[in-house]
Interface confidence: low
């Protein structure tokens, strides 16, 4: 066949849908690869063709749009399943073409099973709520386009296995779920089940997301350097190993980039000739406050190294701070017979 611009298998868009539920999948060509939309392409006389490769098969097959009750259909640039079956899992390709132009992309579709508590291999989106921050809402995601605005669906919300009713601080409000005051105990998976009628049949859409309660911006502070501090002096003899931890606490801040770095005599360690290594570890609290530790290490410190300035720096969206480590050369213990005796005037 003639040449076709093949964008390959777009694994960035690993689409997961639940078994026995409707699914509408847009051809990714118009969203991510081409500079024009479906309407423009259609007006220009281009045709959209769909085909697929079953799981664990190499053979490309046309999609059967002649199934009972129109189970699989295409509408404009959308492939519809009403509903999906487990064996619909595979790689799907949409191809846009006419006699002179061809472009195609494939994407994986995985039909997954869920249990009665909505547990499944589905990758869940995470929605972050600020702790004790007043009313916050989550919205049942990815339900647009499944039914017209004239249809009024019923929506039931669950936390884990439990239907949300008479919860103290969580109130279902149609497509929204309101948290009157978010607490750590609100962490968990929340599921909305949207039920709607279509052509005499009833369909269910199940959408689960993970709620993570995080530190509130009300409580956010600039980075706090716990170490180095004024109470610890790093006293070393030449030839010993110098280890200085820089431990910094960062309040949780949405989309903030937390940075910790050392300077030695005002320069980044990479820009100086001494043999220094830096190891970093990161830990998080339950509200995603972050503690970063960068340990500066000089295996065999010299007397020159012990005269240098070692400064730990930290930066977040809340500000920048720095703290110098107190480093000094250990004074050798006096040898009594010579030095002390001299002190007593012995000759």
């Amino acid at each position: 066949s003639e040449r076709c611009d093949d964008w390959g298998l777009d694994t960035m868009r690993q689409i997961q849908v639940f078994e026995d539920e409707p699914a509408r999948i847009k051809c990714p060509l118009f969203e991510h690869f081409l500079k024009f939309n479906y309407s423009t392409a259609h007006s220009a006389g281009l045709t959209l063709i769909w085909y697929w490769t079953r799981q664990d098969r190499d053979l490309e097959e046309p999609i059967n749009f002649r199934l009972p009750e129109n189970r699989i259909s295409k509408e404009k640039d959308v492939l519809w399943f009403r509903p999906t079956l487990l064996n619909d899992t595979g790689n799907y390709t949409c191809m846009l073409r006419n006699t002179t132009y061809c472009s195609k992309v494939a994407f994986p579709l995985e039909v997954v099973q869920k249990d009665s508590c909505f547990n499944s291999p589905m990758k869940l989106p995470v929605h972050k709520l600020y702790i004790e921050y007043g009313i916050q809402r989550i919205t049942c995601p990815n339900v647009d386009g499944y039914f017209p605005s004239s249809v009024k669906p019923t929506i039931t919300w669950y936390m884990g296995c439990y239907k949300i009713q008479n919860f103290n601080n969580v109130i279902p409000e149609g497509m929204n779920l309101s948290f009157l005051i978010a607490l750590i105990s609100n962490n968990g998976n929340y599921t909305c089940v949207v039920t709607y009628p279509e052509n005499g049949r009833t369909f269910h859409l199940t959408r689960t997301l993970t709620v993570k309660v995080v530190g509130s911006p009300k409580n956010a502070v600039p980075p706090v350097i716990h170490s180095p501090n004024d109470h610890v002096v790093y006293e070393k003899e030449p030839g010993e190993e110098l280890l200085i931890p820089c431990t910094v606490y960062f309040s949780f801040l949405m989309d903030s980039r937390n940075e910790v770095w050392w300077t030695i005599d005002g320069k980044k360690p990479d820009d100086i000739t001494i043999d220094v290594t830096i190891n970093e570890s990161i830990s998080h609290s339950r509200t995603e406050d972050e503690t970063r530790t960068q340990i500066l290490s000089i295996k065999k410190v010299t007397s020159e190294d012990l005269k240098r300035s070692y400064v730990c720096h930290a930066r977040s969206a809340k500000g920048e701070v720095a703290k110098a480590a107190k480093v000094k050369q250990k004074v050798p213990a006096p040898r009594y017979t010579v030095e002390l005796a001299c002190g007593f005037g012995a000759t």
Partner: antibody
């Protein structure tokens, strides 16, 4: 520091019921889950079910559904586990454990309550 | 339900040695919700590790956890006399919550 204090040992007849209590002190009770785990003599640990007092809804392992009732009294910071239709194989130490959050690990445990079922 | 299989059933080691305990899940553990507990005779279990690798409050750094998906490991870098006990893994990511059968670490 939160502590969980359980009720004392019980000896029961087959077919009867037992109700074990678990009182929390020294911390927030309502917003954490309290779960129940049992351990038969010389055996491993077995999860029975749990409750989040603030929500009042309990869930339990299928094996125990219909026989176990898990409740909580927010006013006294106490959770209860009642097991009915007792049989000899229910002889075990019953532990309550605080679930650090709704999907967190069991970070604090009660001291255990020995329940012996014997005719 | 997720079945957790621990191996070996018994581990005979001397103080100061390294202990490696394995826990295998019958299916992937949701969100890495896997914990390790220590139980000494006549005592309630004690949380050592949660979230696969996070040490619980007050747990010495000789205890470490690792793994993902279906295979998890608890390592005790240097056994102390008080470490000889039974160790259980537990998944708390999906209901029903399940425990492994336990590994007994005994003095050789």
């Amino acid at each position: 520091q939160v502590q969980l204090l359980q009720s004392g040992a019980e000896v029961k007849k087959p077919g009867s019921s037992v109700k074990v209590s678990c009182k929390a002190s020294g911390g927030t009770f309502n917003i954490y889950a309290i779960d129940w785990v049992r351990q038969a003599p010389g055996q491993g640990l077995e999860w029975m079910g749990g409750i989040i007092p603030i929500f009042g809804t309990a869930n339990s392992a299928q094996k125990f559904q219909g026989r176990v009732t898990i409740t909580a009294d927010k006013s006294t910071n106490t959770a209860y586990m009642e097991l009915s239709s007792l049989r000899s194989e229910d002889t075990a130490v019953y532990y309550c454990a605080r679930n650090g959050a709704t999907s967190d690990a069991f970070d604090i445990w009660g001291q255990g309550t020995m329940v012996t079922v014997s005719s | 339900e997720i079945v957790l299989t621990q191996s070996p059933g018994t581990l005979s080691l001397s103080p100061g040695e390294r202990a490696t305990l394995s826990c295998r899940a019958s299916q992937s553990v949701s969100s890495n919700y896997l914990a390790w507990f220590q139980q000494r005779p006549g005592q309630a279990p004690r949380l050592l590790i949660y979230g696969v690798s996070r040490r619980a409050t007050g747990i010495p750094d000789r205890f470490s956890g690792s793994g993902s998906g279906t295979d998890f490991t608890l390592t005790i870098s240097r056994l102390e006399p008080e470490d000889f006990a039974v160790y259980y893994c537990q998944q708390y990511g999906s209901s029903p919550l399940t425990f492994g059968g336990g590994t007994k670490v005994e003095i050789k």
